[in-house]
């Protein structure tokens, strides 16, 4: 758990020809507000899909009244922090929306009016506990400078705050694998995380990072039960037991691998890897030359002219193994970038892209808005293969050219007045009723 | 706060047994599992037992077979059974804990520790 924090520095024209002098008047003074929406990962900045790490809407700023002949000033701020709490890890890579609304305070009938002046929108990656990011960013004439960061709430810690520190009332009783938090002398931190994929019924660690097995488990992510046999006994020191697990009769028991050979279990039997020279299930062939042709799948022989020199099998791309037996797994590797699709074409491997990358390993990524414009203060977004726009409030369609008003279905009762609003409308009852809707 | 209490420990033959408890109080999230290390003098201190949520253990090859973990929920109180006890059984033993919000991964380092209580094993 912790917060994500947001520092507005300003808000203003910016640099350039055709800025705007303020987004006040001396008719209509104003004040700005804030409103920022997080989202996990590096997904799209569409403001109407969940804000699903949090969001959080600042105070009014002070009023602001432009003063004719003056020069264009920074605009007035909220005071304090935008805070978004968030429950659990902090995912390390984020997308952002800010937006800068205008709150307008003449003598509008129903009280003030809303309009969304600026949005901006971007994809950052931040560890949690570092230090304030500074970012400067432009959303048509207008600029936002802001910095930010992401803090651990105790007893979280860490770059994701998923490690627990505990308080200690003897900081130098830590135990092994921990360390004093700091700069809290009296707590101990615990690394929570063993190896990835380590079995969380059977496995444990000593060390971040190592998975140890519990009795009757093993294999390097405990995951393979030892053979178990009964040891109960009738009589003896053994009778006033329950039972106890040995390890029975395992398919590598007495090394079945011949000539040197070493034996690795597998699921169903087991496997010889067998020293140059002999091969065959129990490596029981042996004398093989380059003329008995031992290279598999166009490996080539070299060496080996009489039985008692070894022969060394040079394998092509694509097999290895003592005998060129072995087919590598190439895509295990998974050299496709950005969710590309790999092919093992045995010649070759291939990459099949995702719209909206390309190169031989879909390294490259497409400028999907290059060209593309979003109307009426909409934000281009890349994603997918095609642009799409996130638009401002009350504007909708591909390029933001449609009006979408909240307001047109009349969805205030009793003759209450409708208002678009951030977050949807706000209707402004008439005398004598309330509710969202003015129904009460 | 954890608050972790051995006792049980003291002087025995060799051949002889012994039996540790560790009661434990305070836990803020899920005891997860519950280690039993010890430390000779000069010596590192190594893990003996483990003891995880679901009953699964661990021993260290030097006890496999002479010493056996168990917890008591109910009471919320680790065990140690020591038999067979050899001179180089003879250490400070210490129990410690793993706790954490869910018990969903494998059984991390401990958390909490206790202050030990004396093993010594005479030939």
């Known amino acids: 758990a912790g917060v994500f924090e947001l520092q507005i520095h300003s808000f203003g024209p910016g640099p350039g020809p055709g800025a705007p002098r303020s987004p006040c008047s001396a008719r209509l003074p104003c004040r700005l507000f804030f409103r920022v929406c997080l989202k996990p990962g590096l997904s799209e900045e569409a403001a109407e899909s969940p804000c699903a790490l949090g969001a959080a809407l600042s105070a009014r700023g002070p009023v602001y009244t432009e003063q004719p002949g003056a020069p264009a000033p920074d605009l007035p701020l909220p005071d304090g922090l935008l805070q978004v709490p968030f429950r659990d890890a902090w995912p390390g890579t984020f997308s952002f929306i800010i937006e800068t609304w205008r709150e307008e305070l003449g003598d509008q009938i129903g009280g003030p009016a809303w309009s969304l002046l600026a949005r901006v929108a971007g994809r950052r990656r931040l560890a949690a506990g570092g230090p304030w990011a500074r970012d400067i960013q432009r959303a048509g004439a207008w600029e936002l400078r802001f910095s930010y960061r992401a803090r651990c709430e105790p007893p979280a810690v860490g770059t994701a705050c998923t490690r627990l520190c505990r308080p200690r009332s003897a900081p130098s009783r830590c135990g092994p694998g921990l360390r004093p938090c700091a700069p809290l002398e009296d707590e101990c931190e615990a690394p929570l995380v063993c190896r990835a994929g380590c079995s969380p019924e059977h496995g444990f660690c000593e060390q971040p990072g190592e998975c140890r097995c519990l009795e009757g488990w093993t294999g390097p992510l405990c995951t393979v039960p030892v053979s178990t046999s009964s040891c109960l006994s009738p009589r003896g020191p053994s009778s006033a037991t329950t039972g106890c697990l040995v390890p029975g009769p395992g398919p590598c028991d007495g090394n079945p691998c011949a000539n040197g050979g070493s034996c690795s279990e597998t699921p169903r039997s087991f496997e010889c890897t067998c020293p140059r020279g002999f091969y065959g299930l129990r490596c029981e062939v042996s004398g093989v030359t380059c003329a008995d042709g031992p290279c598999f799948n166009g490996g080539l022989c070299v060496g080996g002219a009489d039985p008692d020199s070894a022969y060394i099998c040079h394998c092509p791309p694509g097999f290895q193994g003592s005998n060129c037996e072995k087919r590598v797994d190439r895509c295990s590797l998974q050299p496709c970038r950005n969710g590309g699709l790999c092919l093992d074409l045995g010649h070759a491997l291939r990459c099949r892209c995702r719209a909206g990358f390309a190169g031989p390993r879909c390294e490259h990524d497409l400028d999907d808005c290059a060209g593309r414009a979003c109307a009426n203060g909409g934000t281009c977004v890349e994603g997918g293969g095609a642009h799409r726009c996130s638009c401002a409030l009350g504007f909708g369609g591909r390029d933001c050219r449609e009006r979408a008003d909240p307001c047109a279905a009349r969805p205030c009762a009793h003759g209450g007045r409708c208002y678009a609003h951030f977050s949807g409308l706000v209707c402004a009852c008439a005398p004598g009723y309330m509710g969202a809707r003015c129904e009460f | 706060q954890v608050h972790l209490v051995e006792s049980g420990g003291g002087l025995v033959q060799a051949g002889g047994s012994l039996r540790l408890s560790c009661a434990a109080s305070?836990?803020?999230?899920?005891?997860?599992?519950m280690r039993w290390y010890r430390q000779a003098p000069g010596k590192a201190r190594e893990l003996v037992s483990l003891?995880?949520?679901?009953?699964?253990?661990y021993y260290a090859d030097s006890v496999r077979g002479r010493f056996t973990i168990s917890k008591d929920n109910a009471k919320n109180t680790l065990y140690l059974q020591m038999n067979s006890l050899k001179p180089e059984d003879t250490a400070m033993y210490y129990c410690?804990?793993?706790?954490?919000?869910?018990?969903?991964?494998?059984?991390?380092?401990?958390?909490?520790w206790g202050q030990g209580t004396q093993v010594t094993v005479s030939s």
């Open positions: 003891i995880n949520s679901s009953g699964g253990t």
């Open positions: 305070g836990f803020t999230y899920s005891n997860c599992c």
């Open positions: 410690a804990a793993y706790q954490a919000k869910y018990c969903s991964g494998p059984c991390a380092p401990p958390t909490d």
